[in-house]
């Protein structure tokens, strides 16, 4: 392994789907993946009037937009499903919502908000 | 090395049934996504359904619903597909494929393919 | 059931070109989407999974990006090997679906 990076190597997995997809609803899933290549966790979910709705979670495999990310984050700004990737095992139990503000006139004094969390 | 072996070319009657077999080896059979997909000379993909065998239930697509069974033997690392009730339309290529992962990123290793004809 | 089109269902290029393919779906699908090539005869080979990932071993002149509704599918620098057909497939909900095939010709 290389220094600094957390091996993924199994992901809480879920699916909304499962009576539909006859598939276990939730548990761990192994995450496989050629050797040199990385492998993440993500949770994808959406806001359905301030409800979260988990769609799905579970293993992502080598994305350069999931590299070094030790939480699963969403920061695009109000997708229709959001998504956020992670490294590390079971990284993705929880997810969190944080999307970047447009830089306009900075302050002295900034303030980063505290994203929130679910899980 | 990643493989999945299928079995030989079928030729069928018109209301008699098919039985496909996928060997696998080089991944983990148990805990993977094996899926079948499907193509008609000349046409597109079909997606009929999949399982992992730890789970031991297939997912099938609404279409075949009743008349395909997929299962699967962790002894031996074989996957089957069933089709019955056979028709002319039902002539095809038939793939048994591993997905990438349980939540269906992508379809990875591809068999060789079975062609079935169905044909009186 | 989600209902893939592509666009166009053929073209013709030359070795050196870039082309690009677009992929729809009828509703969104997240990054559920999958690029394959075809050659005749032969079973599909995975190119791009989750929009935009590379599958191991696919040359980095194939790219994919895209989300929600609209994929695409772009090659630079077009190889003699590129020349086949080309399915995008959304696996966000069952069942997973296939467009119909762009075929990439030789001009």
């Known amino acids: 392994a290389i220094l600094g990076r957390s091996e993924t190597q199994e992901c809480l997995f879920f699916n909304a789907n499962w009576e539909k997809d006859r598939t276990n609803q939730t548990g761990v899933e192994p995450c496989y993946g050629d050797k040199d290549k990385r492998r993440h966790c993500f949770a994808t979910w959406k806001n359905i009037s301030g409800s979260i709705e988990i769609v799905k979670q579970g293993c992502w495999l080598d994305d350069i937009n999931c590299y070094d990310r030790t939480d699963c984050v969403e920061k695009k700004d109000s997708p229709e499903v959001y998504f956020c990737c992670c490294e590390g095992n079971m990284c993705n139990e929880k997810f969190s919502y944080f999307p970047e503000m447009e830089v306009t006139q900075p302050t002295s004094n900034p303030v980063t908000p505290k994203p929130p969390y679910y899980n | 090395q990643v493989q999945l072996v299928q079995s030989g070319a079928e030729v069928k009657k018109p209301g008699s049934s098919v039985k496909v077999s996928c060997k696998a080896s080089?991944?983990?059979?148990?805990?993977?996504?094996i899926s079948w997909v499907r193509q008609a000379p000349g046409q597109g993909l079909e997606w009929m359904g999949g399982?992992?065998?730890?789970?031991?239930?297939?997912n099938y697509a609404q279409k075949f619903q009743g008349r395909v069974t997929i299962t699967a033997d962790e002894s031996t690392s074989t996957a089957y597909m069933e089709l019955s009730s056979l028709r002319s339309e039902d002539t095809a290529v038939y793939y048994c494929?591993?997905?990438?992962?349980?939540?269906?990123?992508?379809?990875?290793?591809w068999g060789q393919g079975t062609m079935v004809t169905v044909s009186s | 059931e989600i209902v893939m089109t592509q666009s166009p269902s053929s073209l013709s290029a030359s070795v050196g070109d870039t082309v690009t393919i677009t992929c729809r779906a009828s509703?969104?699908?997240?990054?559920?989407l999958a690029w394959y090539q075809q050659k005749p005869g032969k079973a599909p080979r995975l190119l791009i999974y989750?929009?935009?990932p590379l599958s191991s071993g696919v040359p980095s002149r194939f790219s994919g990006s895209g989300s929600g509704t609209h994929f695409t599918l772009t090659i630079s620098s077009l190889q003699p090997e590129d020349f086949a057909t080309y399915f995008c497939?959304?696996?966000?909900?069952?069942?997973?679906?296939f467009g119909p095939g762009t075929k990439l010709e030789i001009k």
């Open positions: 497939q959304q696996s966000y909900s069952t069942p997973f679906t």
């Open positions: 494929v591993k997905d990438l992962t349980w939540t269906n990123l992508g379809l990875d290793i």
């Open positions: 080089g991944f983990q059979f148990r805990t993977s996504l």
């Open positions: 989750g929009a935009s």
């Open positions: 509703q969104g699908v997240s990054r559920w």
């Open positions: 399982l992992i065998p730890i789970f031991g239930t297939a």
